[in-house]
Interface confidence: medium
């Protein structure tokens, strides 16, 4: 899986669903977050 | 306002060291992961090395072509990001960067410092 | 290491039309795809990530698409700003990499 900056700060976001790529209508961000590329 | 400003660049002879310096402010730097990313003269972007936050026990990681050589290192009471450059070679030679992605209110938050340039030549 | 392969390195187009940039990856990447603008003398600007999200305040005529291996930036109508070079790059597995770049010059 993947452990990186971004897949967790999208991951905090709620950007991703559990499957992972698929962007959702609507997520609840949070301030929890982590850096890269 | 986030704002990341890179210092301690300079002429230096291979063989040599240098630290350099990244001064945040606008965000609560101890909560982020923070990147180097570098840019030789006339050439495309390459990451450098990551250091995660506090809570995750400032863990790094490193490009295979600067492992062993330069160390990345924080200090959150001082909102300061570091890379220290030993053994430098002339291919070091380049423009460091840096960056920091999060996420914070509503969206995707990134921001770059404006570079500092590293010359390694004799 | 994933490698990043852009295309065309230099692509030659006029204000008003449009720019498709290619990004594909040596490996699956699934959608941790951004792309940078970077002009001469300037830090990168991120304008899109999660290879379609568009970033805070970049115009709408820019566009992401993608997913896996393959990638797209499109610029619907270019405008004269629009003229930079602009790289790809993943984060999906460290080391982060980025693509070679490809300049976007005027006509």
């Known amino acids: 899986s993947c452990n990186t900056a971004t897949c967790v700060t999208h991951r905090l976001a709620g950007l991703l669903s559990r499957s992972g790529g698929v962007v959702k209508d609507n997520f609840v961000p949070t301030n929890v977050g982590s850096e890269a590329f | 306002e986030v704002q990341l400003v890179e210092s301690g660049g300079g002429l230096v002879q291979p063989g040599g060291s240098l630290r350099l310096s990244c001064a945040a402010s606008g965000f609560t730097f101890s909560n982020y992961w923070i990147s180097w990313v570098r840019q030789a003269p006339g050439k495309g972007l390459e990451w450098v090395a990551e250091i995660r936050s506090e809570s995750d026990a400032s863990a790094t990681h490193y490009a295979e072509a600067v492992k062993g050589r330069f160390t990345i290192s924080r200090d959150n009471a001082k909102n300061s990001l570091y890379l220290q450059m030993n053994s430098l070679r002339a291919e070091d030679t380049a423009v460091y960067y840096c960056a920091v992605y999060f996420d914070y209110g509503l969206a995707i938050q990134n921001y770059w410092g404006q570079g500092t340039l590293v010359t390694v030549s004799s | 290491e994933i490698v990043l392969t852009q295309s065309p390195a230099t692509l030659s187009l006029s204000p008003g039309e449009r720019a498709t940039l290619s990004c594909k990856a040596s490996k699956r990447v699934t959608t941790y795809v951004s792309w940078y603008q970077q002009k001469p003398g300037q830090a990168p600007r991120l304008l899109i990530y999660g290879a379609s999200n568009r970033y805070l305040g970049i115009p709408a005529r820019f566009s992401g698409s993608g997913s896996g291996t393959d990638f797209t930036l499109t610029i619907s109508s270019l405008e004269p700003e629009d003229f930079a070079v602009y790289y790809c790059?993943?984060?999906?597995?460290?080391?982060?990499?980025f693509g070679q770049g490809t300049k976007l010059e005027i006509k």
């Open positions: 790059s993943q984060s999906y597995n460290y080391p982060y990499t």
